[in-house]
Amino acid sequence: PLATIPVSTTSLTSSEGSTISTPSVDISTPVTTSIVGDQCSRCKNGGFWDGLKCQCLTPYYGESCEEVVNSIDIAPPETVSAQMELTVTVTSVKFTDELKNHSSQEFREFNKTFTEQMNIVYSGIPEYVGVNITNLRLGSVVVEHDVLLRTKYTPEYKTALDNATEVVKQKITKVTTEQIMTNDNCSALMCFNTTGTQVQNITVTQYDPVEECRQKAEEYEDYFLVEYRDQKPYCISPCESGFNASKNCNHGKCQMSQNGARCLCVTTETHWYSGEDCNQGTQKSHHHHHH
């Protein structure tokens, strides 16, 4: 059996010119709703019936998942990071096999001293988090280690991290050139072999809000775009108001279709509206006016 749900209707005209009569509450709400039987078929676009309502997949919403949302949540990470794999040669410590054992007194003391030295070297780099020794080997002591950098996510995070990695390179080059053994003496916390300093690899967090936005928009990827507000990215369709890319439908409603955003123009008791942006109003002749 079918139940008829009464709704007030507003006449809408698409910008192509055809007039359609739709409910004023939600243009996708069906006037008749199946009360019994298989509910699965009423959830469109991959949505599923949970026993009470349709659970819609992004970017859809509505009773039958037929509407396309105006904005999609994208969540950039709070912080972004970079990891630099570096090698330096420490000449002021004799290598022993005990240094390979991370639980030995030798390793713990070396790690403590090396960390203190690097904290001094990299002080003044706001993105600097710390160092992590990954391997120690003979020659005097070849120290393979990671320098960890972190910063708050902003649209310019890559530039900030790239700049920080450059400063790390400059500072490690400077200290390993200056703090060297002279006449078998090292007056610093640690001394280095200048030629043993190498940057092996740099890994930077990859986060692209545009890519996330496009992925989540699925078949509407060409019509969703990223705009920033207070350094935060928003994934929006032109139907979302308040952004540079927002479509102004004037006397109408913006609706997403697979061909992009279009305006559905309103027809009131006194006027009908047309045009791509529903900005062309035509007054109805008086004898068509119904009280």
Epitope: T91, S92, V93, K94, F95, T96, Q105, E106, E109, F110, K112, T113, E116, M181, D184, N185, C186, S187, A188, L189, C191
Partner: nanobody, 124 residues
């Protein structure tokens, strides 16, 4: 973590002697060791140092009067101070490097372990 505890300080008359000891909680065989002092209102200065292979070095102001030595079996460092002067009055502390430290044959080396110190007052 190596704990260093100094002892032997006190009040002594000019020209007399004192022997300071520094007991370490761990192995000092493969460490550079040193004695530092800080007089009231002055900066800390290196007094004497001994490298991991037993080579010693002294500040000019104490050369010929002070002798640094270490007993690896007892994990102890010593400073024999003779012909003491009023200007030797200071808080004396010992320091130790990390294990296997080389190239610390000078007094400016930054040691990573330090004791609390023992006070030496030279006065008549």
């Amino acid at each position: 973590e190596v704990q260093l505890v100094e002892s032997g300080g006190g009040l002594v008359q000019p020209g007399r002697s004192l022997r300071l000891s520094c007991a370490a909680s761990g192995d000092i065989t493969r460490r550079c060791m040193g004695w530092f002092r800080q007089a009231p209102g002055k900066e800390r200065e290196g007094v004497a140092g001994i490298s991991e292979d037993g080579i010693t070095i002294y500040a000019d102001s104490v050369k010929g009067r002070f002798t640094i030595s270490k007993d690896n079996a007892k994990n102890s460092l010593y400073l024999q101070m003779n012909s003491l002067r009023a200007e030797d009055t200071a808080l004396y502390s010992c320091a130790a490097s990390i294990l296997n430290r080389v190239g610390c044959r000078q007094l400016s080396y930054e040691y990573i372990y330090r004791g609390q110190g023992t006070m030496v007052t030279v006065s008549s």
